[in-house]
């Protein structure tokens, strides 16, 4: 392991479309991939009239957008579906939205999801 880098071994798993996709609904996912490549966790969610609806959480393959991010934060301004990725086991348990272009307060507080 490279010093100072959080290795991602496991991620929180959630799939709102678990029946259609024929997967588990919730759990912990072990992350697999090429041994020399980095692994990350991700979370996706929607903000429906101020209510957070998780779409998916799980493992994410080597992506420079996620390097050295210990927190799962979406920075894109007003996406249709929010997406964040991070490094470190279970780092996708909490996720938040801080749009990069905004100088005002973030539109949502950090979220600790509680799947229905």
């Amino acid at each position: 392991a490279i010093l100072g880098r959080s290795e991602t071994q496991e991620c929180i798993f959630y799939n709102a479309n678990w029946e259609r996709d024929r997967t588990n609904r919730t759990g912990v996912e072990s992350c697999y991939g090429d041994k020399d490549k980095r692994r990350h966790c991700f979370a996706t969610w929607k903000n429906i009239s101020g209510s957070i609806e998780i779409v998916k959480q799980g493992c994410w393959l080597d992506d420079i957008n996620c390097y050295d991010r210990t927190d799962c934060i979406e920075k894109k301004d007003s996406p249709e579906v929010y997406f964040c990725c991070c490094e470190g086991s279970m780092c996708n348990e909490r996720f938040s939205y801080f749009p990069e272009m905004e100088v005002t307060q973030p539109t949502s507080n950090p979220v600790t999801p509680k799947p229905p």
Epitope: L61, I64, F83
Partner: antibody
């Protein structure tokens, strides 16, 4: 093992559209991007666009903006690339590739545009 | 999103070393470690050889190495072998906030 299997060759008339599919297996489809690249006969590789299958977020090369649409169906682990308003210069082999590093590629789909 | 610049062709004898350059700008080649190298044999799909400037893809011989200086990346193949004869492309990571771009390709001939 990771595999990306693309749909078969297509022949289209100028002005029409084509939709190429890319079915992924051997890994979790929602764990990385799918990129689309094309290669005209005797020419180099040309990046067309990318999709994050889990969020549906897409980015397209300026050259193809407005003419290309990339989608993904997570229930079948399949990505699609649709190119509209076809012209003869769009005759090429179209490839899908996994991830930001393009570490696995489909076998390619030849699209011929001819009147 | 201009194409990266590569020499059209390079050649070398078996056992020799060759270097292929790939020149871009500060927003593609010069930005972070985004550069990859691909090998393509005639009629085949490209194959990832080097990613992140200098990391060898699994299964790629250590005769292949990558480096970068400023806005120019380089692929060096040492101990040339006949099967190395192919087209080589540089390209950048694509996904999220990053757009992709490829070089025009370099034909490597093993004499």
């Amino acid at each position: 093992q990771v595999q990306l299997v693309q749909s078969g060759a297509e022949v289209r008339k100028p002005g029409s559209s084509v939709k190429v599919s890319c079915k992924a297996s051997g890994y979790t489809f929602t764990s990385s991007y799918i990129n689309w690249v094309r290669q005209a006969p005797g020419q180099g590789l040309e990046w067309m666009g990318t999709i994050n299958p889990v969020s549906g977020s897409t980015s397209y090369a300026q050259k193809f903006q407005g003419r290309v649409t990339i989608t993904a169906d997570t229930s079948t682990s399949t990505a699609y690339m649709e190119l509209s308003s076809l012209r003869s210069e769009d005759t090429a082999v179209y490839y899908c590739a996994r991830g930001g590093w393009f570490d696995y590629w489909g076998q390619g789909t030849l699209v011929t545009v001819s009147s | 999103q201009s194409a990266l610049t590569q020499p059209r062709s390079v050649s070398g004898s078996p056992g020799q070393s060759v270097t292929i350059s790939c020149t871009g700008t500060s927003s593609d080649v010069g930005s972070y470690n985004r550069v990859n190298w691909y090998q393509q044999h005639p009629g085949k799909a490209p194959k990832l050889m080097i990613y992140g400037v200098s990391k060898r893809e699994s299964g790629v011989p250590d005769r292949f190495s990558g480096s970068k200086s400023g806005n120019t990346a380089s692929l060096t193949i040492s101990g040339l072998q006949a099967e190395d004869e192919a087209d080589y492309y540089c390209g950048t990571f694509a996904g999220g906030r990053y757009y992709g771009v490829f070089g025009g390709g370099t034909k490597l001939t093993v004499l």
